[in-house]
């Protein structure tokens, strides 16, 4: 799992000038088996907000025990609180489930800050506002944790939707989605629409608010506008992609594109921020500062620590630039770009100033583990995790926050050469040489 401002711990080289457009591909992607245009029962099945994660209601065991589960595309374990904890309203009680099976194996997951540990087992799992199926899935019953559960977040577990390679304790523990696809006719695809509020929500509003949709097994066309553009999944562990160019207000950062993907770039719904490698972060902040130079903000703001407040309704969105990430396309030498607004990368924060203020944290931060396209990015887009075709699709979200002057965008194609060179190859560690 990723470190840094990561829930639940918590927030182009060789490219030709990209103004040149290729002819638009006219043929839409063929409909996949079992894929429908509308999934009414799954729309609006997520709640929460970017700062504390988005969760879906799930049931575990027989008779079913209802729990809220954080949707996390940056990990691969299904893990639920299974013992009393001050931050949990409820937890999984294995002894009450007639279908629980103990795997007699422990699991320990440490983070940079905090950890969770528990006992592995299997049980029957379903998603009330999901496909009408029940599957036997691996469950890590969390018995002990530190800085994992979040006070007031309203979720009691985590659904890791990435691949088996990063499952704990090892890749032999089949992730939930793999079990779902194997045991049912659900297509090997899911899509996420995370809807950032754009304004702070108090506790009662969060509990009553709609946070978005997780469409399991398909794509709902009502959740996006325009076209879906797909980027290849580089490797099936995290949802790893390749960024080939970065622009701030249309100005190229002009870095070797390998820097953008050092040591990887992933799409992670369990991380709050857009996290960038150190060099990229520094260049991006310098560029954002320059673009917004009519106002100055303290260093602590750019570090994501201090809040900046404006009188309610007067946030000067126009002084902050748009940010574009160009992603490798499906066609050779073709890329597309996704563009986010300050409404995505300035995260509203509640309860700090007066009700007459709108306060925000800068939600772009530094990473030592590569680029993480967290909720800040995902809240602008409908994101399709097309595992069957090893690709991730982006389209403008029907619920993204914008103003009358600018909107998030997904545009292409653009000519970009030598995109394969943008990927960083993580050296394979020879375990025999590791010091113990």
């Amino acid at each position: 799992t990723q470190h840094g401002i990561r829930l639940p711990l918590r927030s182009g080289l060789g490219g030709a000038p990209l103004g040149l457009r290729l002819p638009r591909e006219t043929d839409e992607e063929p409909e996949e088996p079992g894929r429908r245009g509308s999934f009414v029962e799954m729309v609006d099945n997520l709640r929460g907000k970017s700062g504390q994660g988005y969760y879906v209601e799930m049931t575990v065991g027989s008779p079913p025990q209802t729990l809220n589960i954080l949707v996390d595309t940056g990990s691969s374990n299904f893990a639920v609180g299974a013992a009393p904890h001050p931050f949990l309203h409820r937890y999984y009680q294995r002894q009450l489930s007639s279908t629980y099976r103990d795997l007699r194996k422990g699991v320990y997951v440490p983070y940079t800050q905090g950890k969770w540990e528990g006992e592995l087992g299997t049980d029957l799992v379903s998603i009330p506002h999901g496909p009408n199926v029940t599957v036997r899935a691996n469950i890590a019953a969390i018995t002990e944790s530190d800085k994992f559960f979040i006070n007031g977040s309203n979720w009691e577990g985590i659904l890791g939707l990435a691949y088996a390679e990063i499952a704990r304790p090892d890749d032999s523990l089949e992730p939930f989605f793999d079990s779902l696809v194997k045991q049912t006719h659900v297509p090997n695809l899911f899509s996420l629409q995370l809807c950032g509020a754009g304004f702070p929500l108090n506790q009662s509003e969060v509990l009553a608010s709609v946070g978005g949709s997780m469409i399991i097994g398909g794509i709902d066309h009502s959740l996006y506008t325009g076209s879906l553009w797909y980027t290849p999944i580089r490797r099936e562990w995290y949802y790893e992609v390749i960024i080939v160019r970065v622009e701030i207000n249309g100005q190229d950062l002009k870095m070797d594109c390998k820097e953008y993907n050092y040591d990887k770039s992933i799409v992670d719904s369990g991380t709050t921020n857009l996290r960038l490698p150190k060099k990229v972060f520094e260049a991006a902040v310098k560029s954002i500062k320059a673009a917004s130079s009519t106002e100055k903000f303290p260093d602590g703001f750019w570090l994501g620590e201090q809040l900046v407040c404006w009188q309610a309704g007067t946030t000067p969105w126009n002084i902050f630039p748009v940010i574009s990430l160009y992603l490798m396309g499906e066609v050779t030498n073709q890329s597309f770009r996704i563009t986010i607004l300050p409404q995505q990368y300035l995260r509203p924060v509640e309860d700090v100033a007066t009700s007459q203020d709108d306060c925000y944290k800068f939600a772009i931060s530094q990473s030592s583990t590569g680029t993480v396209m967290g909720a800040v990015i995902m809240e602008g887009f409908y994101v399709v995790f097309d595992r069957a075709r090893k690709r991730i699709g982006f389209a403008v979200s029907a619920c993204h926050v914008h103003d009358e002057f600018r909107t998030a965008a997904v545009e292409g194609p653009f000519v970009t050469l030598d995109m394969e060179d943008c990927g960083y190859n993580i050296p394979q560690t020879d375990e025999s040489t590791l010091m113990t």
Epitope: T294, E295, K296, F297, P298, D299, G300, F301, E305, Q306, L307, V308, C309, D351, V352, A353, C359
Partner: antibody, heavy 120, light 108 residues
Framework: QLQLQESGPGLVKPSETLSLTCTVS??????????WGWIRQPPGKGLEWIGN???????YYNPSLKSRVTISVDTSKNQFSLKLSSVTAADTAVYYC????????????WGRGTLVTVSS | EIVLTQSPATLSLSPGERATLSCRAS??????LAWFQQKPGQAPRLLIY???NRATGIPARFSGSGSGTDFTLTISSLEPEDFAVYYC??????????FGGGTKVEIK
């Protein structure tokens, strides 16, 4: 070294507009390293932030005073000014101008203050 | 809204004694907190910024500590000129706006 000096009438009638000017000497108000601000202190009471301004003209105001406050800057005169409209006796205070330094975070240099009394 | 509560309201001490002043925030302000000294008829003077850094020209007997919600200003050995009112201010929420109510350090 850099100094700040407040100036303006010491007596203002209720419902009128209080106007004060802060003159910056020994340095440039156009420095990109600072905001400039106003703080007030009613007699025998604590400090209340009024607002800040950057040399570009960008302003921030205390929400509780926002509807009555205007802060402006005149870089050619190396001055910034405060206007507070519709004053009442509750606006009687010592008014300080100050420099917001240390990365725009802390009031590190203050004027001596000027007492403004609101009375008819 | 973040509220800063200073205690005690008044501290009566003799020169040479150690003074410990407290500032408590209603929610975490990280280490974005300052301390000011104000003598009668004078403007406030910045003593400490970022919770523990002494401002230019401030004697070493003044020290600040704390982070999150609880902060302390310590004057290791009171000098006659240290008897004054002390204010804390948070800048976690920017622009800086919230001052504490003040602690008066008076001669016993």
């Amino acid at each position: 070294q850099l100094q700040l000096q407040e100036s303006g009438p010491g007596l203002v009638k209720p419902s009128e507009t209080l106007s004060l000017t802060c003159t910056v000497s020994g340095g440039s108000i156009s420095s990109s390293s600072y905001y400039w601000g106003w703080i007030r202190q009613p007699p025998g009471k604590g400090l209340e932030w009024i607002g800040n301004i950057y040399y570009s003209g960008s302003t921030y105001y205390n929400p509780s005073l926002k509807s009555r406050v205007t802060i402006s800057v005149d870089t050619s005169k190396n001055q910034f000014s405060l206007k507070l409209s519709s004053v009442t006796a509750a606006d009687t205070a010592v008014y300080y101008c100050a420099r917001l330094g240390h990365g725009y975070n802390y009031f590190d240099l203050w004027g001596r203050g000027t007492l403004v009394t609101v009375s008819s | 809204e973040i509220v800063l509560t200073q205690s005690p309201a008044t501290l009566s001490l003799s020169p040479g004694e150690r003074a410990t002043l407290s500032c408590r925030a209603s929610q975490s302000v990280s280490s974005y907190l300052a301390w000011f000294q104000q003598k009668p008829g004078q403007a406030p003077r910045l003593l400490i910024y970022d919770a523990s850094n002494r401002a230019t020209g401030i004697p070493a007997r003044f020290s600040g500590s704390g982070s999150g919600t609880d902060f302390t200003l310590t004057i290791s050995s009171l000098e006659p000129e240290d008897f004054a009112v002390y204010y804390c201010q948070q800048v976690y929420v920017w622009p800086p706006r919230t001052f504490g109510g003040g602690t008066k350090v008076e001669i016993k």
